[in-house]
Structures are given as C-alpha cells and as structure tokens.
C-alpha cells in the first residue's frame, strides 16, 4: 500500500483581519486508519485547533465532507480571523488506538494577519 503523505501546499497564507482563512491539507492514503487533527504551533505546547472526533470548534469548519470514508481532503476554514490567530498550523495524521498516536505531520502553513482594510 502507498505510504501516506500529508500535503500542506501553502507554506504561508495571508488574510485580512475579520476574513476567513483556508488552510489546505490533503492526504495520499486512507491508511493507517485514524483521525486528522490540526494544531497551532509545534512541540508540547501546541494548541488543538480541530479534531475530527471531538468538538465543537466554533470558528473552524471543514472544506469538504470529512465524514465520508474515502475523503482525502482535510482542509479547514477558520472564520473571523484576528491578529491573535497568526502562527504556524500543522495538519497531523494519527493512528487509531487507545490513545491515538501521532503518525505523520504536514510541513505546516504559516498564517499571517493583515490589518483590516479601512
């Protein structure tokens, strides 16, 4: 079976304050079984932004229908962006288990926030 790759095509994304940011992430294989999670930052203190299996995440929506078994697009949209949302976002595949374990990470997308146009 094909080795899973996690593709975050955008190294950086710039969004005006108040707008929505779309962070793209696609995977190349359905295996191993397990959820995709989005985090802001790396290391122990990273913050959970989206998890298929828990929620709600009021400002985050998925771009495609992630509940479909064959779905490989795990892009997210974050609404009403503020300067506090700036940072690097990682799309990460977990292997199903008790607990789920991290399998592979995307390279990250840096979100920068522009001042609201007057």
């Amino acid at each position: 079976e094909e080795e899973l790759q996690i593709i975050q095509p955008d190294k950086s994304v710039s969004v005006a304050a108040g707008e929505s940011a779309i962070l793209h992430c696609t995977i190349t294989s359905l295996f191993p079984v397990g959820p995709i999670q989005w985090f802001r930052g790396a290391g122990p203190a990273r913050v959970l932004i989206y998890n298929q299996r828990q929620g709600p995440f009021p400002r985050v929506t998925t771009v495609s229908e992630t509940t479909k078994r064959e779905n490989m697009d795990f892009s997210i949209s974050i609404s009403n962006i503020t300067p506090a949302d700036a940072g690097t976002y990682y799309c990460i595949k977990f292997r199903k288990g008790s607990p789920d374990t991290e399998f592979k990470s995307g390279a990250g997308t840096e979100l920068s926030v522009r001042a609201k146009p007057s």
Epitope: A45, R46, V47
Partner: antibody, heavy 117, light 108 residues
Framework: DVQLVESGGGLVRPGESLRLSCAAS????????VTWVRQAPGEGLEWVSL???????YYADSVKGRFTISRDNSKSTLYLQMNGLRAEDTAVYYC???????????WGLGTLVTVSS | EIVLTQSPGTLSVSPGERATFSCRAS??????LAWYQQKPGQAPRLLIY???TRATGIPARFSGSRSGTEFTLTISSLQSEDFAVYYC??????????FGGGTKVEIK
C-alpha cells in the same frame, strides 16, 4: 473568564504522597497544554511538569520518577500525583494554562504543600 | 539546561522613574524569552513574550528588548502597582522551561 483553582495541598511527612488537583474553566481545556510550576517559600519559580493536548508528559529532573501529571478532559481537571515527597518539595504549587508559544498566560492562586517531620 | 541569570537582584526606584533590568541566557534562546510580574501573595502574571511582545492587557509602559542572549525589561514610568518581583523565562519549544532568579523592584 479563565479560572484555574488548585486544591489538595497540605502538611505531609517525608516519604508520603499527595495528589493535587486543578479545576479549569473559561476556556476549552481539551485544546491546551497545562502545566505545574512551584515556588518554595521566599524563593523563585521552578517549572515542574507539563502535559500536552495529546497526553504526552514532561517533567523536571528534580521530580522525575516521583511525580505524575495527568488530566481528565471530561472534568476539565489537571492532576499532580506526588509520591516520595521530600522536604525540598515544600512549595506553593501553581497550575497554569500554556499558550502555543510555550508561555503561561493564566495561573491559579496556588496550593501550599509542606513536607516536614 | 538553559540557565537564566537576572540582575540586579533588587532595584530601588522612585515612582515615576524608569526601571531597567536584565536577564542573560547561558545559551542561545533566539527571541524566546518571557517576563512575568509577581506581587506578594499573588500568582505570577505574564507581561511579555517573544522578547518584546506585550501580553493581552499589559500597559505600554512595559517593554522588552533583546541583544544576543541578553534581554532587558523596561518600565518607562513606574506606577505604585508596578512594585513587585519580575521573573524571566525561556520559552523555547521543549522543556525544561527555566526561570531566572527574579528581580525585586522596590520603592526608593
């Protein structure tokens, strides 16, 4: 408003155990790493332990093998199980919320642990 | 482990004056340095992170700067509520997260 409330401190003898709790509210507990920091009487701050969003744990060398950090996301509560307590563990223990920048933006008021024979 | 050395240990300043104190890291931490304020009987409060970014709600009289491994916190005009102990903390990506020994700012 973010609130962190520690409990479980008290007076124990050397070698005994104690479990501290920290009840969190005002933020989505499951989404953040949380940490314990202590302060011995009249001394500075010392980082003790951290638990990540995914449950990975980290410890200061001074407590490794004796202390265990854990979290119950369903109760929005952080714990610190302290075994084999020593006199040098006497301190006020604070829990704090950790930002993605690895800084501690909200702190509890602390709970005092005294280890003395 | 990164060691942070704060100086001076105590700083005596009159209200309205400028206060400047420093924190030196034993090895490079980039700009990953934070400052906290602690008043007697209270928990620490985050003031500055990334060497010079003020935390939410922190007044503009607090500012931070960096020169290599030396970091400075400046309070431009001391208010009565600013007399406290100030700690630096390195916040590189991985533990242990170390703190400096603190600088006490007292009324002259």
């Amino acid at each position: 408003d973010v609130q962190l409330v520690e409990s479980g401190g008290g007076l124990v003898r050397p070698g005994e155990s104690l479990r501290l709790s920290c009840a969190a509210s005002g933020f989505t507990f499951t989404n953040y790493a949380v940490t314990w920091v202590r302060q011995a009487p009249g001394e500075g701050l010392e980082w003790v332990s951290l638990i990540s969003v995914t449950g990975t744990t980290y410890y200061a060398d001074s407590v490794k093998g004796r202390f265990t950090i854990s979290r119950d996301n369903s109760k929005s509560t952080l714990y610190l199980q302290m075994n084999g307590l020593r006199a040098e563990d006497t301190a006020v223990y604070y829990c704090a919320k950790v930002t993605w920048k690895n800084v501690f933006d909200y702190w509890g008021l602390g709970t005092l642990v005294t280890v003395s024979s | 482990e990164i060691v942070l050395t704060q100086s001076p240990g105590t700083l005596s300043v009159s209200p309205g004056e400028r206060a400047t104190f420093s924190c030196r890291a034993s090895q490079t931490v980039g700009s990953k340095l934070a400052w906290y304020q602690q008043k007697p009987g209270q928990a620490p409060r985050l003031l500055i992170y990334d060497a010079n970014t003020r935390a939410t709600g922190i007044p503009a009289r607090f500012s931070g700067s960096r020169s290599g491994t030396e970091f400075t916190l400046t309070i431009s005009s001391l208010q009565s509520e600013d007399f406290a102990v100030y700690y630096c903390q390195q916040h590189t990506d991985w533990p242990p997260y170390t703190f400096g020994g603190g600088t006490k700012v007292e009324i002259k």
